[in-house]
């Protein structure tokens, strides 16, 4: 229904706390370089204005759209051109072009320092002094580094953060209480960020239809007892929510997400038997819980998929007269029978089915032509199953760090032109799939592995888009989203690459490496490994292992030495010589 004042409507629906949080996230995602204080001031102004509209919906400017109100605020920021360059040109445009322009200027890799966590005592002091400001800083810092973070989920993570601090700051040993808990939240939030970015990419590149297909598959897996009409309704609503968040309409997105959670909890009987625990929780926890609820038990009496989609005489009629509905039904029926498949795989199978019908329904004897379609799915299913087996076996053998290194070598060979920091980041993220998925029960591994890898590779594509350097990467990134992972997996050594010259300084280290945290040490070593591969793209695994073992030994020796600096300056050049010889 239409409201006289959109801003008053959203303020009333969301309540002041969530309203302010979402406005802060929106501003931080649009203008990623502004300080917290600058954004906090704007948020307060917007909130005060919203309150005047709540008191009187007919007050001046209360009838303006949220894009107009927020855009005007952003465009009034002093020194916009000095700080943001051509983004300032957006302010010469009218809505809706102005908002589109802001969206296009979101930076997936802003040049901001890593978000450093203060030490426990300091954190607890500032949290106790002003919890609201403390949480505001958290929202601001995460949102500006992750401009597509799913806003209502970010409020959920802030709430988690708040609860952890409340609990741990009352403990004697704050550090050992906070560290593992906050690490857990950080890990989950980072995964949430890449997953949401993938959804926005799907929406931006391929439109709502592509996202809705993703949603139908995912929801059908989770709610196999819901019928197609129910799944379609949920998928349509979920598509709207994600479209709004990806489009920067964060207030509408959070409001609609709350509505969807409410609908699901009021209609559990026709959706799933597993929702009650989620539905007993308060709003943010409820919506989060519903988004990752366990799969309902599959109905026992599902007929074979072939009956409707292969054996029936009316397949071509159904397809011709209502393509989207028929293919949607196929995707629903196949997905509800296969919670053990990844969404990407299910979408590839639906695409294969569609292509088969396109071809066969134009032939003289369609049933003879499409009669083998289900058998033709086999290689498409085997490929990711083999990928999971091979990679999980390797992970179990090497552990997370060793597995990341194996992936780093593989991907540097596939795309040696890509910058080393991007390769290292990608390999570290791809390598985490082992810890995240390989320990799961067999039937959960494939969906976990492939859908996670697809999300990480989406980030690789986004970073590569900014500065395209590898034809291999361009080829895989320009195809459809669901084909990306198989495309990357199929890449081999890039034969067109001219190896990098060996530069001794790339492999020269100093004693400061000894005091770095373990993670930073790993990154330094992985940077060296990527550079080695760029120098010798066809080096064998054995050669690389020899060099890396030597390198690890060198670091261990020198970091234990009484005179570290002397050790690094004398042993370092010897290491470089040995490396060159080992790779010759």
């Amino acid at each position: 229904e239409a409201h006289k004042s959109e801003i008053a409507h959203r303020y009333n629906d969301l309540g002041e706390q969530h309203f302010k949080g979402l406005v802060l996230i929106a501003f931080s995602q649009y203008l990623q370089k502004c300080s917290y204080d600058e954004h906090a001031k704007l948020v307060q102004e917007v909130t005060d204005f919203a309150k005047t509209c709540v008191a009187d919906e007919s007050a001046a400017n209360c009838d303006k759209s949220l894009h107009t109100l927020f855009g005007d605020k952003l465009c009034a920021i002093p020194n916009l051109r000095e700080n943001y360059g051509e983004l300032a040109d957006c302010c010469t445009k009218q809505e809706p072009e102005r908002n589109e322009c802001f969206l296009q200027h979101k930076d997936d890799n802003p040049s901001l320092p890593p978000f450093e966590r203060p030490e426990a005592e300091a954190m607890c002091t500032s949290f106790k002094e002003n919890p609201t400001t403390f949480m505001g800083h958290y929202l601001h810092e995460v949102a500006r580094r992750h401009p597509y973070f799913y806003a209502p989920e970010l409020l959920y993570y802030a709430e988690q953060y708040n609860e952890i601090l409340t609990q741990c700051c009352a403990e004697a040993d704050k550090e050992s209480c906070l560290t593992p808990k906050l690490d857990g939240v950080k890990e989950k939030a980072l995964v949430s960020s890449v997953r949401q970015r993938m959804k926005c990419s799907s929406m931006q590149k391929f439109g709502e239809r592509a996202f809705k297909a993703w949603a139908v598959a995912r929801l059908s897996q989770t709610f196999p007892n819901a019928d197609f009409a129910e799944i379609t309704k949920l998928a349509t609503d979920l598509t709207k929510v994600n479209k709004e968040c990806c489009h920067g309409d964060l207030l509408e997105c959070a409001d609609d997400r709350a509505e969807l959670a409410k609908y699901m909890c009021e209609n559990q009987a026709t959706i799933s038997s597993k929702l009650q625990t989620c539905c007993d929780k308060p709003l943010l926890k409820k919506a989060h819980c519903l988004s990752e609820v366990e799969h309902d038990t599959m109905p026992a009496d599902l007929p074979a998929i072939a009956a409707d989609f292969v054996e029936d005489q009316e397949v071509c009629k159904n397809y011709a007269e209502a393509k989207d509905v028929f293919l949607g039904t196929f995707l629903y029926e196949y997905s509800r029978r296969h919670p053990d498949y990844s969404v990407s795989l299910l979408l590839r199978l639906a695409k294969k089915y569609e292509a088969t019908l396109e071809k066969c329904c134009a032939e003289a004897n369609p049933p003879a032509c499409y009669g083998t379609v289900l058998a033709e799915f086999q290689p498409l299913v085997e490929e990711p199953k083999n990928l999971v087996k091979t990679n999980c076996d390797l992970y179990e053998k090497l552990g997370e760090y060793g597995f990341q290194n194996a992936i780093l070598v593989r991907y540097t060979q596939k795309a040696p032109q890509v910058s080393t920091p991007t390769l290292v980041e990608a390999a570290r993220n791809l390598g985490r799939v082992g810890t995240k998925c390989c320990t799961l029960p067999e039937d959960q591994r494939l969906p976990c592995v492939e859908d996670y890898l697809s999300a990480i590779l989406n980030r690789v594509c986004l970073l590569h888009e900014k500065t395209p350097v590898s034809e291999h990467v361009t080829k895989c990134c320009s195809g459809s989203l669901v084909e990306r992972r198989p495309c990357f997996s199929a890449l081999t050594v890039d034969e067109t690459y001219v190896p990098k010259e060996f530069k001794a300084e790339t492999f020269t280290f100093h004693s400061d490496i000894c005091t770095l945290p373990e993670k930073e040490k790993q990154i330094k070593k992985q940077t060296a490994l990527a550079e080695l591969v760029k120098h010798k793209p066809k080096a064998t695994a054995e050669q690389l292992k020899t060099v890396m073992d030597d390198f690890a030994q060198f670091l261990d020796t020198c970091c234990k030495a009484a005179d570290k600096d002397t050790c690094f300056s004398t042993e370092g050049p010897n290491l470089v010589t040995r490396c060159k010889d080992a790779l010759a």
Partner: nanobody, 126 residues
Framework: EVQLLESGGGLVQPGGSLRLSCAAS????????VAWFRQAPGKGREFVAG????????YYADSVKGRFTISRDNSKNTLYLQMNSLRPEDTAVYYC???????????????????WGQGTLVTVSS
């Protein structure tokens, strides 16, 4: 739970007409694939006509094409079968069946329909 109730059957002379109705409750009729089947004494259930849910695609058995018309009235949540030019071989108990959640009729196989009415008898005889 879906309930279906057929009505409109009776005795009719060859060449005559009848209109069968199937009232549904517990589910909107436009959201689900619905079909008419018939069963003559000593025979299995045979597909007569069907209509898709959400999309008005209609399907007919070859033996009734041009004589029977399937339709529905969403406001009344009712399915109809208009039967013209009736023949003695059309004599049977007529059932309506539904496959909730199937937006299209994708089968003429009775086993794939989980919900049925109790049937209405149609006798074509002079």
């Amino acid at each position: 739970e879906v309930q279906l109730l057929e009505s409109g059957g009776g005795l009719v002379q060859p060449g005559g007409s009848l209109r069968l109705s199937c009232a549904a409750s517990g589910r909107y009729i436009d959201e689900t694939a619905v079909a008419w089947f018939r069963q003559a004494p000593g025979k299995g259930r045979e597909f007569v006509a069907g209509i898709g849910g959400g999309v008005d695609i209609t399907y007919y058995a070859d033996s009734v094409k041009g004589r029977f018309t399937i339709s529905r009235d969403n406001s009344k949540n009712t399915l109809y079968l208009q039967m013209n030019s009736l023949r003695p071989e059309d004599t049977a108990v007529y059932y309506c069946g539904t496959r909730p959640g199937r937006p299209l009729i994708t089968s003429k196989v009775a086993d794939l329909y989980p919900y049925w009415g109790q049937g209405t008898l149609v006798t074509v005889s002079s």
